[in-house]
């Protein structure tokens, strides 16, 4: 009997109630491999989730997050609120990055500006809350009297769209 079930392809299940006949998965369920005794219930993308890929008889639905949120975890198991660039999400909501740190995305944490001297370089462009520094040549490469750091470009909304 087991051999009969192994013949059931993806999108079907081996129906014990019908003498091991391969029956199609019912609506809103799927089987992604052959030889299944049951079909799995399709994931539903509700609330802060939106459907990225509809469920089919052979594959589960895939979810994304609605605007203003981003995915976390395997297969977008959670949605986390976006912040603005120059901020990070804390338990009390979005907070500005502290001086000396930046976040150039709508998600993630504020990170320390790169330490250019670690690589023997100088600071070419100063960091901001939204941008890391840009490192430049080593101080020895700079001509005498030249300023090692230039001010950041005027603040603007770079329109980051991280995943």
């Amino acid at each position: 009997l087991q051999d009969l079930c192994s013949n059931c392809p993806a999108g079907t299940f081996c129906d014990n109630n019908r003498s091991q006949i391969c029956s199609p998965c019912p609506p809103n369920s799927f089987s992604s491999a052959g030889g299944q005794r049951t079909c799995d219930i399709c994931r539903q993308c509700k609330g802060v989730f939106k459907t990225r890929k509809e469920c089919s008889s052979t594959s589960n639905a895939e979810c994304d997050c609605i605007s203003g949120y981003h995915c976390l975890g395997a297969e977008c198991s959670m949605c986390e609120q976006d912040c603005k660039q120059g901020q990070e999400l804390t338990k009390k909501g979005c907070k500005d990055c502290c001086f000396g740190t930046f976040n150039d995305q709508k998600r993630g944490i504020c990170r320390p500006w790169t330490n250019c001297s670690l690589d023997g370089k100088s600071v070419l462009v100063n960091g901001t809350k939204e941008r890391d520094v840009v490192c430049g040549p080593s101080p020895a490469d700079l001509s005498p009297g030249a300023s090692s750091a230039t001010p950041p470009a005027p603040a603007r909304e770079p329109g980051h769209s991280p995943q």
């Epitope: 995305q105 790169t114 690589d119 890391d132 770079p158 991280p162």
Partner: antibody
Amino acid sequence: QVQLVQSGAEVKKPGASVKVSCKASGYTFTSYWINWVKQAPGQGLEWIGNIYPSDSYTNYNQKFKDKATITADKSTSTAYMELSSLRSEDTAVYYCTRDYGSAYSYSLWGQGTTVTVSS
Amino acid sequence: DIQMTQSPSSLSASVGDRVTITCRPSQDISNYLNWYQQKPDKTVKLLIYYTSRLRSGVPSRFSGSGSGTDFTFTISSLQPEDIATYFCQQGDTLPYTFGQGTKLEIK
């Protein structure tokens, strides 16, 4: 000396997976982003994603989100990129790169790893 | 995604010629524009970063200029060892994107 050394060429069948490695040496691995870049035969360069080895924070190009998984092992100063469900269009040279003091440009490139997908 | 329109896609020039390549992003990227050289053996090297900053050790015949949505890469006097494909890349906005490349040949 400062360098990135990638694993050797791979030939895989459609549907298989491949894991490419990128070993860093000569600098503090945890202080710089590692990026992965794809170059299909006769084509330009495409940014796949990057990782900050210090905390394994990753960014992905949406186009490669379901294809590539980027990881890093601090103990061996090695970054990895796994490509799943391989298809013929995944045939390419894959480069790992290190940023130039901030994530916005890539000063150091690996020699490239050729991945060929063929039945 | 920001599209990077690079032109020309290929060009042939003589040793000593001045060569110019342009790169036009589909939106303002401030000065976050870099230029790379890929030699025929597929090795890749950063030449210019942040629009106009010459990487240490790169010959001064290479230069870059521009801002916003219009950038130029120039080789002031072409040398035989400059045979390569050149790419621009924006580092302003994720996902970072490259131009399609300019293949440079010697006449």
